[in-house]
Structures are given as C-alpha cells and as structure tokens.
C-alpha cells in the first residue's frame, strides 16, 4: 500500500491548474453532483436527523429498564448500533458534497465508513439472538422460566458485538487514503491490492454472513413461530405477522441493493459498462442501507400506535410500552402477550 502524506515535493513545479493543492479540495468534474450522489445526500440528512433523535430516545427509554426487562436489553443494543452508525453521517455527507474528497485522515477513513458494516453485522447478530429468544419463549417456555435472565441476555449481546467487530475487520483493514493528482484531491477507498480474489472473498463473506444466511435462518425461525402461534389461535397473531413481515421486508429492501452491487462489482471487469454504472450508484446504495439506522424507531412508534391505539400518549411513554413489555412465559400465550416485542425482530434485520 502507498505510504500517504500530504506533501508532494516531487510535484511542486506543477503550477496553476496542475498544482496538487489539498487545501482547495475541489474536484470540478462537473459543477454539480451526480443525481445518485444528490439522492444519497438527501437520504443521509433524513437518516441522520431521524436516526440520532429516534435512537437517542430509544436508548433513553430502554436504558432505565434494561436491568429488569430483557426486551429492553435487545432494543437498547439495537439502538446503540444504529446511533453509532448515524454519528458517521456528517463526515460522509461532507465528503460527498466535496465530490468524495476526504480531508479527515487515515484513521477516520478506516473507522467511519466501516460503521455501517459494523451496524449490519451487529444488527443481524442481535436479530438472530432476539429470534432465538422468541423461539425459546414459544417452544421451550419451561427452560425460559428457569434460565432466561438479564445476565444471559447481556452475554448474548456481548457475543453478538464481538462477532460483529470481527466481521468488520476486513473492511477496516483494507481502507486507505490516497492522493489523486488529477483532479487534485484525497480519496478514502478500499484497496485489496491487485488481488481480485481477495476482493471477491470479502464480498462473498459479506453477502453470505450479512444477508443470505441470516435471511434463511430467520425465515425458518419465524415460520415455526408463526405456525405455532396460528395453531394456538393466538389473539394477536395477525399483528405479530405484520411486524415479522416488516422485519424481513426492511432487511430485504434496505440491504439488498448494497449486497447485490457489492457482489456484482467484485466479479465484473472494472471497465465494463455495468461496473461503471454500479460504481456511480455506490453512494446511493450505501445511503439506502443507512435507512436501517433510522427505521427502527419509526417502526416502534407505528407499531405502538397500531397495537395499542395510543395516539394521544407521549412518544417516550408509547416507546416504553412497546420496548419494555416483558414476556410472560406461558406456552404460546407467552408469545402472544408480548407480541409487540417481536419488534425486536425488526431492529436487527437492518
């Protein structure tokens, strides 16, 4: 990899237009940004506002309940993952506005763009944990009565976070900053050296572990849960189904473009028209995936209103009812009584 520094003594004689002046990071490729980049900026702005405020509120509501309510632990962790990812958005936004110039240094280049992947893995792993919890509540209620506790929930979350960090390492390691001489700017990007196989391997692992495998396992898991719920004629089974569908749908909708473009670009020749088109859509796909970071609080509010008709309640109160309702372990009723907390599902579908 290139050693990176901000001075270019060898090129000092390149005057006027030719000077690499990193203090004026202007890529004047055209006077305006490309349409996909403009759309990405709009999405980033909305996600930042909704994501920071919404997830901060969720953290505030669940933090007080996390000691005694397991569902609160799940939602707290999901909200933290989303909140952390949202913190990178002002930097990513600024970079796109400057035609992807990156004046923030190497450490920021490694960390900030990797946060969305950390969020993806953390969310998916937490969703798997919540799904396992839902499954056990329905199929192993006695086990839950004996062993399901806050301590175990925190351990499960810690394991999920640890695995998520491990899975994000490749993205972190391969990110570098590099000077571009024409147009003059600094770029933050992924460098797999010239090894296309390594790039493909990373893309495949990301697709399988971050998308296909969780999708398969969660679909199977919830199919069993819903079949059991229906067979017991649970009072809220249709509402449970709606939440589950919302979870799976959001997972598909928001991560699919990112995953598909990622895997396609790793297999396509860089000069092919398809590759070039996908490259132009890169920022838009990332921003689309980022919607996951703000969608959970919206789903909680919608679900809270839909299930309880609490339109007149304050937002924190509504969220508290949705996020901290504890499961009562009584066979299938244990599931239906706390149907709302299947929302946990959604949150990590992201």
């Amino acid at each position: 990899m290139d050693s990176f520094n901000y001075t270019t003594p060898d090129y000092g004689h390149y005057d006027d237009k030719d000077t690499l002046d990193l203090n004026t990071p202007v890529d004047k490729t055209s006077n305006t940004l490309r349409v996909p980049d403009i759309l990405a900026l709009v999405i980033f702005a909305v996600v930042f506002l909704v994501g920071v405020l919404g997830n901060a509120l969720v953290v505030w509501v669940t933090a007080f309940e996390a000691k005694r309510t397991i569902n609160a632990i799940w939602f707290l962790n999901l909200a933290v993952a989303d909140f952390l990812s949202c913190l990178a958005l002002p930097i990513l936004f600024t970079s796109i506005v400057q035609h992807h110039h990156w004046p923030f240094g190497g450490a920021a280049c490694s960390i900030l763009p990797s946060l969305i992947l950390l969020n993806m893995y953390a969310s998916i792993l937490l969703l798997a944990t919540i799904s396992a919890d839902r499954f056990l509540l329905v199929f192993k209620p006695i086990w839950c009565q004996n062993f399901r506790g806050a301590g175990l929930a925190w351990i499960a979350c810690a394991v999920a976070w640890g695995l998520a960090l491990l899975l994000t390492i490749p993205s972190f390691l391969y990110r570098v900053v590099r000077e571009e001489y024409f147009p003059p700017k600094v770029l933050c990007g992924v460098d797999y050296s010239h090894d296309k196989r390594r790039e493909r391997a990373v893309a495949i692992v990301r697709l399988v572990l971050g998308f296909l495998w969780p999708l398969l396992t969660l679909t199977i898991c919830y199919t069993f849960i819903l079949l059991r719920t229906w067979s017991r004629r649970a009072t809220r089974s249709t509402k449970t189904l709606k939440v589950v569908v919302a979870v799976v749908a959001s997972f598909f909708i928001f991560w699919l473009p990112y995953q598909v473009t990622g895997i396609m670009m790793s297999f396509l020749e860089p000069s092919s028209p398809t590759f070039l088109l996908l490259k132009k859509l890169d920022s838009l796909c990332v921003s689309f995936a980022y919607i996951n970071c703000c969608i959970n609080p919206i789903i909680y509010v919608v679900a809270g209103q839909g299930f309880q008709g609490r339109l007149r309640k304050s937002l924190p109160s509504l969220l508290r009812n949705v996020l901290t309702e504890e499961s009562v372990v009584r066979e299938s009723k244990s599931f239906t009584r706390s149907t709302v907390d299947t929302m946990a599902q959604k949150t990590q579908a992201v």
Epitope: K17, K28, D37, H100, F182, V190, D191, L276, K279, K280
Partner: antibody
Framework: EVQLQQSGPELVKPGASVKISCKAS????????MSWMKQSHGKSLEWIGD????????IYNQKFKGKATLTVDRSSSTAYMDLRSLTSEDSAVYYC?????????????????WGTGTTVTVSS | EIVLTQSPTTMAASPGEKITITCSAT???????LHWYQQKPGFSPKLLIY???NLASGVPARFSGSGSGTSYSLTIGTMEAEDVATYYC?????????FGSGTKLEIK
C-alpha cells in the same frame, strides 16, 4: 463499439502549429478522461497530459508545457491537441487514449482504449 | 519522475516457448498502478494487463502478470506467432505518468 478516431497525417513546416483531433464514439464522452501520448519513431511512449471532458481542466507533463494545449468539444465528443512552435523533435505519432475517472474511488490510470494515431512530420 | 526500465530490450522466441519480460521501477509503485500494453507493428498500443495481474477484455489466458514494489513481470505461457509485438509497462501512480522503454518480441 468503442472507438477513438484521430485525424489524418500532418506535414508541417518548422515553427508552425498543428491541431490534432480525436473523435470518441460508442461510450459516454464525459465519463472518461482523455490522455495524449507521443511516440517518436522507434521509441517508447511519452505521456503528454490529461483533460477532463466535463470542464476542460487539464494537467500536463512538465516537458510538454508550452508545447501542447489540450481542449475538448463536448457537443461533438471530440478532444483536441494543439502543438505549437514545431521542430523536427516533434515529429512523431501522437495518440489519444481514454481512462475512466472514478469519482468516489481510486482511479488507476490505465488506458483501455487508444486512438488510431496521428503522424506528424515536421520538415522544411 | 519514476523511470521504468524493461529487459530485455529485444528477444526472439520459438512458438510454444515461455517468455518473461521484466519491468523495473526507480521507486516503489503500488501494484494497482502498474499496467502492460501490447503494440503490434503498425498499430496503436492495446491494453493487455491492468493492475499488475488482471487480463484486459479479450486477452488470451496465456498472458499473465505479477510483481510488487519496484519489480514487475509479464509472462507469456506459450509463445504464439500473433504475439510478435512490442510490450510496454506503464505506471499511473505519479505525475508524470511514465512508460517503460519497451521490449520487442520477435519469433525465431
């Protein structure tokens, strides 16, 4: 089919100027930056400079500053190179070649399509 | 300026023979920025290999590239008559972009 069609051979007198054209077809002209290269008879290639077709921004090899001027006409998808104050040293084949500029990630500056070449002969 | 020196300058090979051309740089280059071109007599150069080891579209699999730092090589697994050409390496990492001195490959 992607093509870079260059203008025909030029025979010019020392001290004169010449304008070589490179017409692009088969792709979006503004997606690729254009480079120009010089190849003297029996010798290797020398990079002259690059031009951004979107706005005309350019960068030159210091060796060719004052000798070459790069311009574009977006409406006709054509790149031009002006060579002035010609001497026998400027007798060569000149090529245009495109390279893709990635806005959001590293560009590696390899020339995937080359022009047909324009032979410039400077002789009195 | 990074100077690229190719060796050999000229070489003659028999059909079926394995050929290796080397390209040496005066300072280290990231392997992503080293490319190879083929120029047949009377024609324009053509991209052969980009980013050290990736074959350009339509290039036969008998061509391969490798290397890192200051030392790179182009290999033709089994020489064929149509491979008669001059081969150039090129670096795109620094300004000015530079080409190797060229290796002329002939057939015995």
């Amino acid at each position: 089919e992607v093509q870079l069609q260059q203008s025909g051979p030029e025979l010019v007198k020392p001290g004169a100027s010449v304008k070589i054209s490179c017409k692009a077809s088969g792709y979006t002209f503004t997606d690729y930056y254009m480079s120009w290269m010089k190849q003297s008879h029996g010798k290797s290639l020398e990079w002259i400079g690059d031009i951004n077709p979107n706005n005309g921004d350019n960068i030159y090899n210091q060796k060719f500053k004052g000798k070459a001027t790069l311009t574009v006409d977006r409406s006709s998808s054509t790149a031009y190179m002006d060579l002035r104050s010609l001497t026998s040293e400027d007798s060569a084949v000149y090529y245009c070649a495109r390279w893709y500029y990635y806005v959001s990630s590293f560009s590696y500056w390899y020339f995937d399509v080359w022009g047909t070449g324009t032979t410039v002969t400077v002789s009195s | 300026e990074i100077v690229l020196t190719q060796s050999p300058t000229t070489m003659a090979a028999s059909p079926g023979e394995k050929i290796t051309i080397t390209c040496s740089a005066t300072s280290s280059i990231n392997s992503n920025y080293l490319h190879w071109y083929q120029q047949k007599p009377g024609f324009s150069p053509k991209l052969l290999i980009y980013r050290t080891s990736n074959l350009a579209s339509g290039v036969p699999a008998r061509f391969s590239g490798s290397g890192s730092g200051t030392s790179y090589s182009l290999t033709i697994g089994t020489m064929e008559a149509e491979d008669v050409a001059t081969y150039y390496c090129q670096q795109g990492r620094t300004i000015p972009r530079t080409f190797g001195s060229g290796t002329k490959l002939e057939i015995k």
